[in-house]
Interface confidence: low
């Protein structure tokens, strides 16, 4: 039984030799005795190698200690060189002696680790490496040989040294080129070599550590988690992986580390560590960190694993139910949802599925590249959880707003000048969404505004006055807005009535809604003559003769000239409104006219003997004021109607009536020139009498106080120079003829 004092009072074991270093010759016997106050143990060099049969440890009595052990090694060899340690068995208190076994035939000791014969070095200027060629003789002259190429290193008392207990020390970069090294000692002209050491240059740089999947991972309880951690390093790197993960309730994590074949041509090494959990539970939720260490360098990467107890799907906040957009803009309707796993997203418009195309892209958000009015409607997004198949739907109404568009802006105004004293009507037809409640009218005197042709807004007025303030201008009345369905769109029509055209002015209609504003500026140029008339009819038909007459007071005007607005004058029509043609006469076609005079007026006539469709257009009559030399212009739009053979649209209905009633029938004929209509009864031409009335150019036939003999087949025939068209109707007269007094 071991008896002893508490550790506090223990003295180190006592050795039989007083020296710290003991030198003995090879082949002699080494014997050291150790005494102490507790159970003792001996430890000697290469103890783990099979040396026990040569080493004898025996109990020894005598002296004042009952704890005593003697170590004996007969016939020592150079390899027995090293530290001999006697220590207490259960307390870390010991005494050591270093023994050199001087063996001139084998001055280098082969240690246990030397069996590998490998020296690992790093290419680092500041690092030193130890080649463990320890010696059995302390004062040897040792050099280090490196090859290939052959190079010898000798201790320099500084960074290169040899110590019998350690080996040969030198900066590692000095031998990084070498494939192998060995130590060499000279004793009595005899050369002795240590074992060969292979030099392995070890890298340490870790370029990066990549986790896959890279971002937050979402799983449902029971699913498999696989995390791959890939490290890229420089060559000759040894790597250790460590995973830090939430403390799991069950030990079901599996980690597999392996080297990965790098891509050809890359000067990098790749390592992969895979963490697998076959069936995750809620307790596996948390942060997972992969740490890669090369000894000198550590790199890490982390990800968050979220474990849901079950699949779910729900919309997040901020999903709009109404989206408003302006025509032409890009519309984006994002879907905000919370889901595991990611949902299938389907979009529908007014109940019909939407597929992506070049104008519309569907997915996590609906994108309409350039929204049109046709895109307005109800859009429904349906999210489906692919595991639970739970569905959530949300509807978004898309309202497409249209800034006010004023229809007349696109047209050429048929008038540029207005006759003094006449009543005139100006109109703005506006389409907008949301529809307009108000269209504002403004005005300004013509001389208070400047005119810049070719600009998008050719008129510039410093300020506009509201039409209610018509002081100094024309008396105005704005009629109540009317709403009309034009080209399938609900439009607002605002009319400005000028009671008497007395002053030249500019009028502006302005419409504003939430999508924007629109305006139209109308030039209202008032002249006291000239006047234009069209003879013989206001709207002649092609191949008819037609004359344009421009009449001006001979005392006021001179230099009457006709012009036609042609294709080379299109710049006149550009921009916000019609350019005042008087300011741009050089751009017009001058026409030859015939001048007539009467007692008060000059009349300039342009005659078309055989009018064609090419003759229609805008004609300008220009006259110069004799006093002021100011030109006055008037525009007339000449419309030539195309020739058209007669046509009777629709059928004439058969009519049944009783004696004494009235029959009315209309012949719905059209054509150009206006057809001449003739009625026949039973193929006999019908003539007017007291009971038969023909009206509206024979278009309407009325038979009053019908008699039995008025029944029969009536035919309406419409004829012009291009031909005739006919339609028939049957009149049936019921009832008996009353006897007259004459009978």
């Amino acid at each position: 039984a071991s008896v002893g004092l508490p550790g506090d009072f223990l003295h180190p074991p006592k050795l039989s030799t007083q020296k710290d270093i003991l030198t003995i010759l090879a082949n002699t016997t080494l014997q050291i005795t150790c005494r102490g106050q507790r159970d003792l143990d001996w430890l000697w060099p290469n103890a783990q190698r099979d040396s026990e049969e040569r080493v004898l440890v025996t109990e020894c009595g005598g002296g004042d200690s009952i704890f005593c052990k003697t170590l004996t090694i007969p016939r020592v060899v150079g390899n027995d060189t090293g530290a001999y340690k006697c220590s207490y068995r259960d307390v870390d208190i010991a005494s050591t002696v270093y023994v050199y076994v001087r063996d001139y035939r084998s001055p280098f000791i082969a240690s246990v680790s030397d069996q590998h014969g490998i020296v690992y070095i790093t290419e680092n200027k500041n690092k030193t490496v130890v080649i463990p060629c320890r010696g059995s003789i302390s004062n040897l002259n040792v050099s280090l040989c490196a090859r290939y190429p052959e190079k010898r290193f000798v201790p320099d008392g500084n960074r290169i040294s040899w110590d019998s207990e350690i080996g040969f020390t030198l900066p590692s970069y000095m031998i990084s080129y070498a494939g192998m090294v060995f130590c060499e000692a000279k004793i009595n002209d005899e050369t002795y070599q240590s074992i060969m050491y292979i030099v392995v240059v070890v890298g340490y740089r870790i370029y990066d550590v990549i986790l896959s999947p890279p971002h937050e991972i979402e799983l449902s309880a029971g699913e498999k988690l696989v995390l791959n951690c890939t490290a890229r390093t420089e060559l000759n790197v040894g790597l250790d992986f460590t995973w830090h993960s939430p403390p799991s309730k069950s030990h079901h994590k599996k980690i597999v580390n392996r080297d990965v074949k790098p891509f050809p041509g890359t000067v990098a090494k790749m390592f992969l560590s895979t963490l697998t959990i076959e069936s995750v539970t809620k307790s596996d939720q948390g942060e997972y960190t992969c740490v890669a260490s090369s000894g000198r360098m550590i790199k890490r990467n982390r990800t968050f694993v979220r474990v849901h107890t079950k699949p779910f799907i729900a919309f997040g906040s901020g999903m709009k139910s109404l989206v408003e957009a302006t025509v032409g803009s890009q519309v984006r309707i994002p879907v905000k949802y919370l889901s595991y796993p990611a949902p299938d997203i389907k979009w529908y418009r007014n109940g019909r599925p939407i597929e992506s195309n070049y104008t519309m892209i569907v997915g996590d958000e609906l994108t309409i590249m350039e929204v049109t009015e046709r895109d307005a409607g109800n859009y429904t997004v349906i999210l489906t959880n692919p595991i639970s198949m739970e569905k959530q739907s949300h509807m978004v109404s898309l309202v497409v707003n249209v800034p006010p568009q004023i229809g007349e802006k696109a047209l050429i105004s048929p008038m540029d000048s207005y006759q003094y004293g006449t009543m005139q009507t100006l109109t703005c037809t506006v389409y907008a969404n949301p529809p307009l409640h108000h269209i504002q009218w403004y005005w300004q005197l013509e001389e208070a505004c400047s005119y810049r042709p070719g600009q998008t807004s050719p008129y510039a007025c410093k300020e506009w006055r509201h039409v209610e303030d018509f002081q100094g201008g024309n008396k105005i009345e704005v009629t109540k807005n009317q709403y009309a369905l034009i080209e399938g769109k609900n439009k607002t029509v605002s009319t400005l009535v000028i009671q008497a055209a007395n002053v030249s002015a500019l009028y502006k209609c302005e419409a504003i809604n939430k999508a924007g504003r629109g305006e139209r500026v109308i030039s209202f140029h008032v002249i006291r003559g000239p006047e234009i008339t069209v003879q013989p009819a206001a709207q002649p038909t092609e191949q008819e003769s037609v004359s344009l007459l421009c009449t001006a007071d001979r005392n006021t005007f001179e230099n009457l000239t006709w012009y036609k607005l042609g294709s080379q004058a299109t710049s006149v029509h550009m921009g916000e409104s019609l350019t005042p043609v008087c300011k741009n006469l050089d751009a017009l076609w001058k026409l030859n006219g015939t001048m007539f005079s009467n007692s008060t007026n000059d009349i300039l006539i342009v005659a078309f003997q055989n009018a064609s469709l090419q003759d229609q257009g805008d004609y300008v009559c220009s006259a110069q004021d004799k006093k002021t030399k100011k030109r006055h212009c008037l525009v007339k739009q000449l419309i030539i109607l195309e020739r058209m053979a007669p046509m009777i649209t629709g059928n004439l209905e058969n009519q049944t009536t009783t004696i004494g009633e009235t029959i009315e029938v209309t012949c719905p004929a059209s054509g150009n020139p206006t057809p001449h209509i003739t009625w026949f009864k039973d193929n006999e031409t019908l003539v007017e009498d007291s009971g038969i009335v023909l009206r509206d150019g024979n278009r309407n036939l009325t038979i009053r106080r019908v008699r039995k003999e008025d029944g029969g087949l009536y035919t309406c025939q419409a004829c012009n120079v291009l031909g005739c068209a006919r339609a028939e109707t049957l009149f049936i007269i019921e009832g008996a003829q009353e006897k007259t007094n004459l009978e």
Epitope: Q285, S317, L338
Partner: antibody, heavy 119, light 111 residues
């Protein structure tokens, strides 16, 4: 799984007060915790919550007035500068169902702790 | 922020009968609504979540439904133990805001 609030007492206006919710059987690194209060005779009022990752979210009226923090087993609610309007029973609550990390209805509630703010 | 408007208190029902409580949301909250029961001096108890899903351990006499932004809690086969105050709660989250509000509560009286 259970929750228990503590720290409720009578305080004077302006004196900071911290309430603690002690958690049993719930891993706070996996679940979010919320705080709800109820003034005497009044309805429930949501204050805020702390997510599993430690992010905090507050009702707009509670921002700056309350601070939520947590350790591995407790969740604290600090009333930074109490006023008499803060007199209420304070509940801590948890969504142990975990219907998504941020969809918080509460299926586990503590019994509540009463805070009285009076001068 | 979302405002939840509940049926005015009290709502009365006879034992064995049915009562319905309505909760109107001021904006779309989808199905993100829960119902709670609270008796005097006690902590609230979850009845319904996700507008219509029954919480575990809650009798099937309790049911929830949604129509747009209007939510309804129906208690059928009314029992004396159902006398309590019932609260609706909206809950949802997005990266930039959270809205997690309770309705004002509706007291149910059982005759």
């Amino acid at each position: 799984q259970s929750l228990e609030e503590s720290g409720g007492r009578l305080v004077t206006p302006g004196t900071p007060l911290t309430l603690t919710c002690t958690v049993s059987g719930i891993d706070l690194s996996s679940y979010a915790m919320g705080w709800v209060r109820q003034a005497p005779g009044k309805g429930l009022e949501w204050i805020g919550f702390i997510s599993s990752s430690g992010s905090t979210y507050y009702a707009s009226w509670a921002k700056g007035r309350f601070t939520i923090s947590k350790t591995s087993t407790t969740v604290d609610l600090k009333i930074t500068s109490p006023t008499t309007e803060d007199t209420a029973t304070y509940f801590c609550a948890n969504n142990y169902d975990d219907y998504g990390d941020f969809l918080h209805y509460f299926n586990i509630w503590g019994p509540g702790t009463l805070v009285t703010v009076s001068s | 922020a979302v405002v939840l408007t509940q049926t005015a208190s009290p709502v009365s029902g006879a034992v064995g009968g049915t009562v319905t409580i309505k909760c109107q949301a001021s904006q779309h909250i989808y199905s993100n609504l829960a119902w709670y029961q609270q008796k005097p001096g006690q902590r609230p108890k979850l009845l319904i979540y996700a507008a219509s899903k029954l919480a575990s351990g809650v009798p099937s006499r309790f049911s929830g439904s949604r129509s747009g932004t209007e939510f309804t809690l129906t208690i059928s086969d009314l029992e004396c133990a159902d006398a309590a105050t019932y609260y609706c709660q909206s809950y949802y989250y997005s990266s930039d805001s959270t809205d997690n509000t309770f309705g004002g509560g509706t007291e149910v009286v059982v005759k």
